[in-house]
Interface confidence: medium
């Protein structure tokens, strides 16, 4: 492979490897690898492996999150599970004869143990294991609200399945809200979608650990598969650094246009179709703020400079641990235009025309 | 601003301006600006301006679409509006006394005039103007299906509003499905969310052009504000080029790992924590496919080379019309890891660790 100069493929790989070294340590806010002296012998505990697999499954089933990454999102997230209050608890008594819904209760003190502060929560998912089913059903999820009302959260069209399958609902906002309140019991309701004219509103979906017991649906295995919250949160000790360390800024128009930033930033550029391009044929708009990205993204050698100060720079200058980080557009917006073809005016939308923010990538 | 060499700010701007020149022409598949000889004098027709404003509103209310851009999405989209079948049409008779829903009928031959081929459709939005309202209501949208059944499409929680506001629903899949069928009348239903235990399932939302007439809700103004489909589609003549011209490839692992591409592509790189980093402290996984981006993204001078062949290169090598395009990650995936802190095993998720595809940006 060659650009202007011949590229030393091995050197690029080495730089990438060393960048990844710094990236991982930096994401974990570690100045050096943790000591291994106290690690117990033997394989990993089953619960830890199960949690790891839950997280890996989530990765496999999702595309990359494309939103500009807030500072806190750059850092690693600790993953924990909070199981639903046991079905034998008296709290479930009133709900057992309701055919259109199943109820899941959670103890917020269990959640608070995993996530001591609401802002630390990065993501919360409600995970339910649906048993095999031959029917299609449209289901809904609700959150228990004050004075016995229910707030709609989302829905899913469940198609027939030959094997049990995990359902996942993003309940980050709900859990963050619970953490902002006092401790207590909170609830979700999983219901059949009730149509205005339909008579049969029975929930035909069976959820492992809630629906009538089946053989083998007991003990630890049953416990692993009963509804739970999968939580991803910034550990408290890491969060304290977030407040004290130099903030990673969004390299957007708000920041860049009002600063004298020398490094990578979005730069202002207005294109006047007539003056800049000598074009009269675009009738609307007369011009637009195209903007562009410019400024260095220094490559940080982590090999012989493993200091907190240097690691903190990764977040801003090389978050992707690139062998040669580059200042490129992050958020782009489309541009609608009006022009004529003969006598016929046309409205067309041009994608990715306006640079709103940049990033080192 | 300076990197290694001093950057000539004016030259960068000039290069960006000239890149935009080529980009716009390329997006419209024009070898040169269209002739203005036949343009009628006077202001733009009102309907064209209204359509332009609808498109601009859509841009303002949305963030940039972050998905990797398919080849067709690079090119300009023609924007058209298809109004709902007039309320005086006998087809509405049966629906007038239903309190929980309002119905909107569309003639697919009107849609086909704007979008002759299903694959040309890029986006279809159902736009409804909601009149001012003092109530909060949870509403749902359905599509008419064969044998008089309705398919759920989506929902919205509508809060009280002092002014009329536009609601927009993405109905791209539905409209593409209609275009795959024979012509005829198709319908949407906009309904109150009916709860399993609630008695009042009346729709309290009023939609302009459907709900009982109000003063000033007549003539052209009424017509502009009655429910419509906003369609974005690749014009037929532009689509024929898509089939014949050199395809823009996704620079992902599927393509890059099996080709000898010299230009920008994702390059294979497996990191073995132990061998490459000398680390034993990460227990799971043992390593991961980090990958990296490498290869030139040639800058294309459009100033003195306005030929179809050159313009076609923009799509692959400089789709963002950058002054210095750069090969960077497009799709990234997180990596969950297991490690110990003292005796305590931790599961953490590291964001944006795996490069799945690259792009010139």
């Amino acid at each position: 492979l060659s650009t202007c100069k011949t590229i030393d493929m091995e050197l690029v790989k080495r730089k990438r490897i060393e960048a990844i070294r710094g990236q991982i340590l930096s994401k974990l806010r570690l100045a050096s690898p943790p000591s291994q002296g106290e690690v117990p012998p033997g394989p990993l505990p089953e619960a830890v492996l199960a949690l790891y697999n839950s997280t890996r499954d989530r990765v496999a089933g999702e595309s990359a999150d494309p939103e500009p990454e807030p500072e806190a999102d750059y850092y690693a997230k600790e993953v924990t599970r909070v199981l639903m209050v046991d079905r034998n608890n008296a709290i479930y008594e009133k709900t057992k004869d309701i055919s259109h819904s199943i109820y899941m209760f959670f103890n917020t003190s269990d959640i608070r143990e995993a996530v001591p502060e609401p802002p630390l929560l990065s993501r919360a998912e409600l995970r339910l294991q649906r048993l095999k089913s031959s029917v299609e059903q449209h289901v809904e999820l609700y959150q228990k609200y004050s004075n016995n009302s229910w707030r709609y959260l989302g829905n899913r069209l469940l198609t027939p399945t030959d094997t049990p399958e995990w359902l996942s609902f993003d309940v980050t906002g709900v859990v963050r809200q619970w953490l902002n309140q006092g401790d207590g019991i909170q609830a979700f309701r999983f219901s059949a979608h009730c149509s205005c004219d339909s008579k049969d509103n029975k929930l035909h979906v069976e959820i492992n650990g809630i629906s009538p017991k089946r053989r083998g649906d007991l003990g630890t295995i049953h416990d692993m598969n009963r509804p739970f919250l999968l939580l991803m949160a910034t550990p408290l000790e890491r969060a304290q650094h977030l407040h004290s360390s130099r903030h990673r800024r969004a390299l957007d128009t708000n920041y860049c246009f009002s600063s004298t930033e020398k490094n990578c930033c979005v730069r202002q550029l207005y294109i006047d179709f007539r003056k800049d391009l000598g074009w009269k044929w675009i009738h609307e708009p007369k011009g637009y703020h195209a903007n562009f990205c410019l400024g260095p993204c220094p490559y940080i050698w982590s090999l012989d400079t493993q200091y907190s100060k240097v690691l903190a720079l990764y977040n801003q200058h090389n978050p992707g641990a690139s062998a040669s980080p580059c200042c490129v557009p992050q958020a782009l917006e489309p541009l609608p235009i009006v022009y004529y073809v003969g006598r016929k005016p046309k409205v067309e939308q041009l994608s990715n025309m306006i640079v709103r923010s940049c990033k080192c990538s | 601003l300076s990197t290694c060499k001093t950057i000539d700010m004016e030259l960068v701007k000039r290069k960006r301006i000239e890149a935009i020149r080529g980009q716009i022409l390329s997006k419209l598949r024009l070898a040169s600006p269209p002739s203005q000889g036949e343009v009628p004098p006077g202001p733009l027709p009102e309907a064209v301006l209204a359509l332009y404003n609808s498109t601009r509103d859509r841009v303002a209310g949305e963030s940039a679409d972050p998905e990797p851009e398919p080849e067709a999405d690079y090119y300009a989209k023609e924007v058209t509006r298809v109004l709902m079948v007039d309320r005086n049409n006998a087809i509405y008779e049966k629906t007038k006394d239903i309190s929980h829903s309002i119905y909107m009928f569309f003639n697919t031959s009107d849609i086909r005039e704007a979008v002759p081929e299903p694959p040309l459709l890029s986006r279809a939005e159902l736009r409804l103007q909601r009149l001012k309202s003092s109530v909060e209501q949870h509403v749902e949208l359905y599509q008419k299906y064969s044998n008089n059944s309705w398919r759920y499409l989506g929902n919205r929680l509508l809060t009280p509003t002092d002014t009329p506001e536009w609601l927009s629903f993405d109905v791209t899949g539905v409209v593409r499905q209609w275009l795959n069928q024979g012509d005829g009348i198709q319908a949407f239903r906009f309904s109150a969310h009916c709860s399993c235990d609630s008695k009042d399932n009346k729709l309290h939302v009023e939609i302009n052009g459907i709900s009982p007439k109000r003063r000033g809700d007549l003539g052209t103004i009424h017509d502009m504000n009655r429910p419509f489909l906003l369609l974005m589609a690749t014009p037929l003549e532009r689509a024929q080029h898509l089939h014949s011209s050199r395809h823009r490839r996704a620079l992902d692992t599927n393509y890059c790992f099996s080709s000898t591409e010299k230009n920008c592509c994702v390059r294979q790189l497996y990191i073995d924590f132990r061998k490459d980093l000398g680390w034993k402290w990460i227990h799971e996984p043992k390593g991961y496919h980090a990958n990296f981006c490498l290869g030139p993204c040639p800058y294309i001078w459009s100033l003195d080379t306005q030929y179809s062949k050159v313009l076609a290169l923009y799509n692959q090598h400089n789709p963002g019309a950058s002054a210095s395009p750069c090969c960077v990650p497009q799709a990234l995936e997180p990596l969950p890891i297991v490690y110990y802190v003292g005796r305590k095993p931790k599961v953490e998720q590291l964001s944006n660790m795996i490069v799945r595809s690259c792009k010139c940006s």
């Epitope: - | 031959s109 005829g184 024929q240």
Partner: antibody, heavy 120, light 112 residues
Framework: EVQLVESGGGLVQPGGSLRLSCAAS????????VHWVRQAPGKGLEWVSH????????YYADAVKGRFTMSRDNGKNTLYLQMNGLKSEDTAVYYC?????????????WGQGTQVTVSS | LPVLTQLSSMSGSPGQTVTITCTGS?????????LSWYQQLPGTAPKLLIY???NRASGVPNRFSGSKSGNLASLTITGLQAEDEADYYC????????????FGGGTKLTVL
Amino acid sequence: EVQLVESGGGLVQPGGSLRLSCAASGFTFSNYGVHWVRQAPGKGLEWVSHISAAGISRYYADAVKGRFTMSRDNGKNTLYLQMNGLKSEDTAVYYCAKDRIRSSYEYDSWGQGTQVTVSS
Amino acid sequence: LPVLTQLSSMSGSPGQTVTITCTGSSSNIGGGYYLSWYQQLPGTAPKLLIYNANNRASGVPNRFSGSKSGNLASLTITGLQAEDEADYYCGCYDSSLSTGYVFGGGTKLTVL
């Protein structure tokens, strides 16, 4: 005047192939969807396949799916039907028909038909 | 069996009014899809008579009219003439079939 003229029919053995053509004139061929419809001896009409104006979308009846391929050359104003793996039940008069508007599935112009006989 | 049902034969005397019916379902006629009527004279190709259920094709005499209600479509010929002796087919797109388009079995109209 709109004209559609089919050709390419004939006698073929089971398992054999034939390619039918339909030459169009008197209208802007590239603006309309076109269909093949067949009629077995003494029987009713049966829709076979459809190709859209630009040739991007194609649809086939279940009875011919995987065996027949419809294509068009808008430069030559010609429609084609490549028929492979022919069976005795494919014996029929094959008509090409033009859509009234775009792809309305309403056939306002028909060819005179071409006879296809599949027999050993 | 055809998805669209037509009587296989009908007859009428010159000057009379005859109505040929075509019964479908909510996935074709009742689904709002465009319904057409075709006339096929002996030994010739079919010809479009009615499109979109009730619109006469150009050059079709106004003795021919079409209507539709629910899952039923009708073709009415008033003032029957000898040259109207032919096979009549209804046709419609069907959303429940992968085939897409369907014709009725055809009605053989004899003018006595």
